[in-house]
């Protein structure tokens, strides 16, 4: 799996999980989140050569097409596969509220 | 939806469905498929600015992050959303076989 266990341990130009820390206020303009101040969102990036973690038959076809037609702009792309929620704390007045924001953290990637 | 009805009628730099015809023999080196000789596979390409057909909260976060950090390589990517199968005819010896290859045709796209 193209997850932290594999990607953060190996130097990999191909599609893999990359670390990315996001500060809510500075990077997103989200002012209301009290805790955490930011989080490890991660992202997916890298080349998608033939058979590198292809998601579907179409992405396999596209990467094969791309090897024969490298000048074409048609090629698979490295995107998120497994995502996890993030629990946040914010306040309404003096009342603390806990909320779970879905699909906030990327755990693994694929070529799609 | 970023499908043929919308994308093939509009000139769109952002993420959209693009036409792509694939010739099995020439483009993939697949000599075993008798019919069809090729098919309209299509592909997804284009920019993913903030809120342009974002697939998940993470892709929204990433495109928003990208507006204030445009030099960062972290940005969502335009990939296939809905896929359809393709029916093919091939021969085993002189015996014709009909098979459905799943996820061969892209019908719409998303930013992921």
């Amino acid at each position: 799996a193209l997850d932290a266990a594999y990607c953060f341990r190996n130097v990999q130009d191909n599609c893999c999980l990359r670390p990315l820390y996001i500060d809510f206020k500075r990077d997103l303009g989200w002012k209301w989140i009290h805790e955490p101040k930011g989080y490890n969102a991660n992202f997916c990036a890298g080349a998608c050569p033939y058979l590198w973690s292809s998601d579907t038959q179409h992405s396999r076809v596209l990467s094969l097409y791309n090897t024969i037609n490298p000048e074409a702009s048609a090629s698979p792309c490295c995107v998120s596969q497994d995502l996890e929620p993030l629990t946040i704390l914010y306040y309404i007045g003096k009342t603390p509220k806990i909320e779970q924001l879905s699909n906030m953290i990327v755990k693994s990637c694929k070529c799609s | 939806a970023l499908d043929a009805a919308y994308c093939f009628r509009n000139v769109q730099d952002n993420c959209c469905l693009r036409p792509l015809y694939i010739d099995f023999k020439r483009d993939l080196g697949w000599k075993w498929i008798h019919e069809p000789k090729g098919y309209n596979a299509n592909f997804c390409a284009g920019a993913c600015p903030y809120l342009w057909s974002s697939d998940t909260q993470h892709s929204r976060v990433l495109s928003l992050y990208n507006t204030i950090n445009p030099e960062a390589s972290a940005s969502p990517c335009c990939v296939s959303q809905d896929l359809e199968p393709l029916t093919i005819l091939y021969y085993i010896g002189k015996t014709p076989k009909i098979e459905q290859l799943s996820n061969m045709i892209v019908k719409s796209c998303k930013c992921s």
Epitope: K31, I92, K97 | Y50
Partner: antibody, heavy 121, light 110 residues
């Protein structure tokens, strides 16, 4: 504690104009500062914000490239890069209700009196 | 994103009556909402923040409520001094927005 805008005047289209908001009685380094404009007879239109601590800026999607915000220890500037007749309005600067991390999450409690910008050839 | 729709655009109310102004966000703003009052030729004045907290010096006849995407400002026992335009503002985010303010509601006191 007060805010005072200055620099509003009659300009010809395309002539850059800088508006200044001068703060008294508090430190700009602790507060989020915004610019909001109001065309005659129209509603409030947010232009952007400059954060107290980091100094990072956010602009309304329509305002990107048309306006630039910057600050010193006592002033916040708004540069209208190439004014058009659509930019004719009273320009207000506003301060976030809370200092520090709270910033402007609870709205703007302190406003200047506004400065009028007229664009005409 | 986070577009604010305010209704009605204008409302007439008798002295002593009650007026209700609604504000709808295009997505959840987690109670990050402020209300302002503006009289002609004057700067806006903060009335309510965090959807329901009264700003200092604001009379208790002003009441804010709501959560998620739906918010309400209620003015009860309306006085002549309440004739003004009222604006809501989402304060959840500054990122990727067009305008955090609603279009405004003019309150005419008879």
């Amino acid at each position: 504690q007060s805010l005072e805008e200055s620099g509003g005047r009659l300009v010809t289209p395309g002539t850059p104009l800088t508006l200044t908001c001068t703060a008294s009685g508090f430190s700009l380094s602790s507060y989020d500062m915004s610019w909001v404009r109001q065309a005659p007879g129209k509603g409030l239109e947010w232009i952007g914000i400059i954060y107290g601590g980091s100094g990072s800026t956010w602009y309304a999607s329509w305002a990107k490239g048309r306006f630039t915000m910057s600050k010193t220890s006592t002033t916040v500037d708004l540069k209208i890069t190439s004014p058009t007749t659509e930019d004719m309005a009273t320009y207000f600067c506003a301060r976030g209700r809370d200092g520090g991390a709270g910033g402007s999450r609870n709205g703007y409690s302190l406003w200047g009196q506004g400065t009028l910008v007229t664009v005409s050839s | 994103a986070y577009d604010m729709t305010q209704t009605p655009a204008s409302v007439e109310v008798a002295v002593g009556g009650t007026v209700t102004i609604k504000c709808q966000a295009s997505e959840s703003i987690y109670s990050g909402l402020a209300w302002y009052q503006q009289t002609p030729g004057q700067r806006p004045k903060l009335l309510i923040y965090a959807a329901s907290d009264l700003a200092s010096g604001v009379p208790s006849r002003f009441k804010g409520s709501g959560s998620g995407t739906e918010y309400t400002l209620t003015i009860s026992g309306v006085e002549c001094a309440d004739a003004a335009t009222y604006y809501c503002q989402q304060t959840w985010t500054d990122g990727g927005i067009d305008n955090p303010f609603g279009g405004g509601t003019e309150v005419v006191v008879k």
